[in-house]
Each structure stands twice: as structure tokens, then as C-alpha cells.
């Protein structure tokens, strides 16, 4: 029986050109995590395997960094990075747990606009 739950950072936003950490956490189970896949829609971004370590997909190697922990860091964000991200936990003996994160990449921050029009 699968008793675990995945907690994620949920819906997050970040600024174009910046970076963001995608985090998932598996709790309420004693199952052994054998592998975590990070996917964007149907594209594989990276895999962290308990035996083989981290492997980043070649097409994302320049913009994706492993960690912290089982999380994933996306760098040099573009508006095209907006969308759904999934952390897929492969565990033994439970099976597979999936978490979802929605990332919105914004053109510029409210803070930047505000600073531009500050009255002295």
C-alpha cells in the first residue's frame, strides 16, 4: 500500500534571466527512494539515481544544475520555461510517486517597475 505523500513548492514565479529551485519532498513512507526523475511536460530534464548519481539531459545541461538535495535548479530562465514540472519518485517497495510544480516566468518584477518610478 502506498502511504507516502509528496510535498512540492506548488505554484511559483520567477523573473526572466533569473534562477529558481524546484523542490519536492516525499514523506509519510519508509520506502527507499531509488531514483528521482525531473520532467517538464513530456521532456526529461534530469535524473538523480541512488547508485549512479545525477545525470542531466544534454539539451538542458547549460541551464540545469543538480540540487540542492533531490531538487533541481533552473538557471537563465526564459518565458518559454513557463509550465508544469514534475518530480517522479521511484521507490521500493511502494512504487512511483509524482509531484507537480507550476512555474511562471515573468518578464520583469514589480519591484523593478516600482524602483523606476520612485519619487525622491
Amino acid at each position: 500500500m502506498m502511504t507516502g505523500t509528496i510535498e512540492t513548492t506548488g505554484n511559483i514565479s520567477a523573473e526572466k534571466g533569473g534562477s529558481i529551485i524546484l523542490q519536492c519532498h516525499l514523506s509519510s513512507t519508509t520506502a527507499q527512494v531509488t531514483q528521482v526523475n525531473w520532467e517538464q511536460q513530456d521532456q526529461l530534464l534530469a535524473i538523480c539515481n541512488a547508485d549512479l548519481g545525477w545525470h542531466i539531459s544534454p539539451s538542458f545541461k547549460d541551464r540545469v544544475a543538480p540540487g540542492p538535495g533531490l531538487g533541481l535548479t533552473l538557471q537563465s530562465l526564459t518565458v518559454n520555461d513557463t509550465g508544469e514540472y514534475f518530480c517522479i519518485y521511484h521507490t521500493y517497495p511502494d512504487g512511483t510517486y509524482t509531484g507537480r510544480i507550476f512555474l511562471e516566468v515573468l518578464e520583469s518584477s514589480v519591484a523593478e517597475h516600482g524602483a523606476r518610478f520612485q519619487i525622491p
Epitope: 526529461l44 544534454p58 517522479i88 512511483t96
Partner: nanobody, 117 residues
Framework: EVQLVESGGGLVQAGGSLRLSCAAS????????MGWFRQAPGKERELVAS????????NYADSVKGRFTISADNAKNTVYLQMNSLKPEDTAVYYC??????????WGQGTQVTVTS
């Protein structure tokens, strides 16, 4: 499922070389990385080297850096471990492993490497 068969182990004098091969068959489309591990008597299994299936990323244990080289031939579905400047402490059973996108690693049966001084 992926099946792995290792070969190339043997007895060699310190300072010598060996080349291990690991041939993969079955669901090789699911492989994203492969690695060589070793286990000496009374010790835990350790990762020696790994390579992404595309061949663009390699990782090595500190103890073998500069001496061992891992490479992949996708056309032959084979991964190699070239071991140079072998030391007696490299003596172990060497295992090949394949990581699958589906989350289950496949393992070979192992090949014995013995380095004499």
C-alpha cells in the same frame, strides 16, 4: 528490462592494464546512464565511473581519476572501462549497471579483477 554481460576481467600485475566491456541488450532505449561499480572482499560496493548514454558526461571516483577511462559505443550498446596503472587495491569484482528512465537499475553478473604486486 535490460540485460548486461561483462567481460575482460582477469589477473594482471601491478602497473598493468585491463579493459572491461559491458554489453547491454533488451530495452536499451530506456537507458540514460551506465556505470561501473566494484566490490572488494569485506568492503561495500562503490561507484568507480559512470557515463551518460549520450556519452557527454562522465564521473569518476577520486581513487581512479587519471587511471581509468569510461566510454560508450551506442552503436554496439556497449560500455567500456579502460583501467591503466592498476594497483593491488583495485582488486575486486567489477559490476556493470544500467540506469533506466523507468527507475529500475539493471546489473551484470560481475567480472573478477585481481592485481598482484
Amino acid at each position: 528490462e535490460v540485460q548486461l554481460v561483462e567481460s575482460g576481467g582477469g589477473l594482471v600485475q601491478a602497473g598493468g592494464s585491463l579493459r572491461l566491456s559491458c554489453a547491454a541488450s533488451g530495452s536499451t532505449f530506456s537507458i540514460y546512464a551506465m556505470g561501473w561499480f566494484r566490490q572488494a572482499p569485506g568492503k561495500e560496493r562503490e561507484l568507480v565511473a559512470s557515463i551518460s548514454w549520450s556519452g557527454d558526461t562522465t564521473n569518476y571516483a577520486d581513487s581512479v581519476k587519471g587511471r581509468f577511462t569510461i566510454s560508450a559505443d551506442n552503436a554496439k550498446n556497449t560500455v567500456y572501462l579502460q583501467m591503466n596503472s592498476l594497483k593491488p587495491e583495485d582488486t575486486a569484482v567489477y559490476y556493470c549497471a544500467a540506469g533506466s528512465v523507468y527507475g529500475r537499475n539493471s546489473w551484470g553478473q560481475g567480472t573478477q579483477v585481481t592485481v598482484t604486486s
